[in-house]
């Protein structure tokens, strides 16, 4: 279970659209799939496919659903309680330090190293030194541009709040 979870944008409700009102907030909070009304008296449903909330909350607006970028595939659609899950296309990966884009996996390891891990949607190929068996973390020649792997990063983006 990874730890790369990014804050999502707040999406103002479209005032013209009909809003489904639910029961009053409990302890000032509304259940997942809802947000609180401006006067704090009602819980209003998020709009399926448009926005969502994953937790009990006092959000004034639900969170805007992520749209998968080109170069990504949609693993699961956005619901009122869960954001879209996007994953990098085959041959590309998303690293923790730049979660906003998928990067091409390296095609091979630098000289003197062997491949011990394949390209996945969340990590580059993994290379180790032939002799020592230690992972590669330094610079390599410019022709083999290195991208640091980030194993364990989930299909992204996803939202997490505590």
């Amino acid at each position: 279970e990874s730890a790369l979870i990014t804050q999502q944008d707040l999406a103002p409700q479209q005032r013209a659209a009909p809003q489904q009102k639910r029961s009053s907030p409990s302890e000032g909070l509304c259940p997942p799939g809802h947000h609180i009304s401006e006067d704090g008296r009602d819980c209003i449903s998020c709009k399926y496919g448009q926005d969502y909330s994953t937790h009990w909350n006092d959000l004034l607006f639900c969170l805007r659903c992520t749209r998968c970028d080109s170069g990504e595939v949609e693993l699961s659609p956005c619901t009122t309680t869960r954001n879209t899950v996007c994953q990098c296309e085959e041959g590309t990966f998303r690293e923790e330090d730049s979660p906003e884009m998928c990067r091409k996996c390296r095609t091979g390891c630098p000289r003197g190293m062997v491949k011990v891990g394949d390209c996945t949607p969340w990590s580059d190929i993994e290379c180790v030194h032939k002799e020592s068996g230690t992972k590669h973390s330094g610079e390599v020649p410019a022709v083999e541009e290195t991208v640091t792997s980030s194993p364990g990063t989930p299909a992204s983006p996803c939202s997490l709040s505590g």
């Epitope: 979870i5 990014t6 909070l29 009990w56 909350n57 006092d58 709040s161």
Partner: antibody, heavy 122, light 107 residues
Framework: QVQLVESGGGVVQPGRSLRLSCAAS????????IHWVRQAPGKGLEWVAV????????YYADSVKGRFTISRDNSKNTLYLQMNSLRAEDTAVYYC???????????????WGRGTLVTVSS | DIQMTQSPSSLSASVGDRVTITCRAS??????LAWYQQKPGKVPKLLIY???TLQSGVPSRFSGSGSGTDFTLTISSLQPEDVATYYC?????????FGGGTKVEIK
């Protein structure tokens, strides 16, 4: 009274296990994501783990991943932290903290327990 | 991972002084920053969230500002009860990261 109370700390040898508990009262426990945060003696704060309100998702700091397991029992208003393969560097006061998910922010902690001290030493 | 760097690590000021603590993120975090106060032997207490929103019950002499990578906690008039260590924390994404802390003492 709105509070979190940790228990289960103590002295343990390296490589052994310990389970911490955090009892919640005064609020609806099942509405909140709850975190563990630790503080080594004389040091700063370090986030350890979080579990979602319904237990459906758990996330860990790299330093404890694969060794610690966070869980909860909403029927008992209790949070747990199972700590295995303990190391000297895990010595710290462990706090449980309530995470806040609101219109202006998500991840800050608005309620902390008093903490329980875990000492890993041979 | 995003690193949070606080400065200074400690400071000493007189009662009534204006005290400023800074927190810098290694990458932009919008305004997803909280400040906590931890008095000696006590539990951390939330002071400010969303970079500048004062938590209920916190004295108005505390204020926060900043966005992106640079943030500031200001105590407009230092009081004896403000002796504590102050921590910033970013919460735009996991892992949640705290600054190293700033210890505030009275001269």
């Amino acid at each position: 009274q709105v509070q979190l109370v940790e228990s289960g700390g103590g002295v343990v040898q390296p490589g052994r296990s310990l389970r911490l508990s955090c009892a919640a009262s005064g609020f609806t426990f099942s509405y909140y994501g709850i975190h563990w945060v630790r503080q080594a003696p004389g040091k700063g704060l370090e986030w350890v783990a979080v579990i979602w309100y319904d237990g459906s998702n758990k996330y860990y700091a790299d330093s404890v991943k694969g060794r610690f397991t966070i869980s909860r029992d909403n029927s008992k208003n209790t949070l747990y932290l199972q700590m295995n393969s303990l190391r000297a560097e895990d010595t710290a006061v462990y706090y449980c903290a309530r995470g806040r998910y609101s219109s202006s922010s998500w991840w800050y902690f608005d309620l902390w327990g008093r903490g329980t001290l875990v000492t890993v030493s041979s | 991972d995003i690193q949070m760097t606080q400065s200074p690590s400690s400071l000493s000021a007189s009662v009534g002084d204006r005290v400023t603590i800074t927190c810098r993120a290694s990458q932009g975090i919008s305004n997803y920053l909280a400040w906590y106060q931890q008095k000696p032997g006590k539990v951390p207490k939330l002071l400010i969230y969303a970079a500048s929103t004062l938590q209920s019950g916190v004295p108005s002499r505390f204020s926060g500002s900043g966005s992106g990578t640079d943030f500031t906690l200001t105590i407009s008039s230092l009081q004896p009860e403000d002796v504590a260590t102050y921590y910033c924390q970013k919460y735009n994404s996991a892992p949640l990261t705290f600054g190293g802390g700033t210890k505030v003492e009275i001269k």
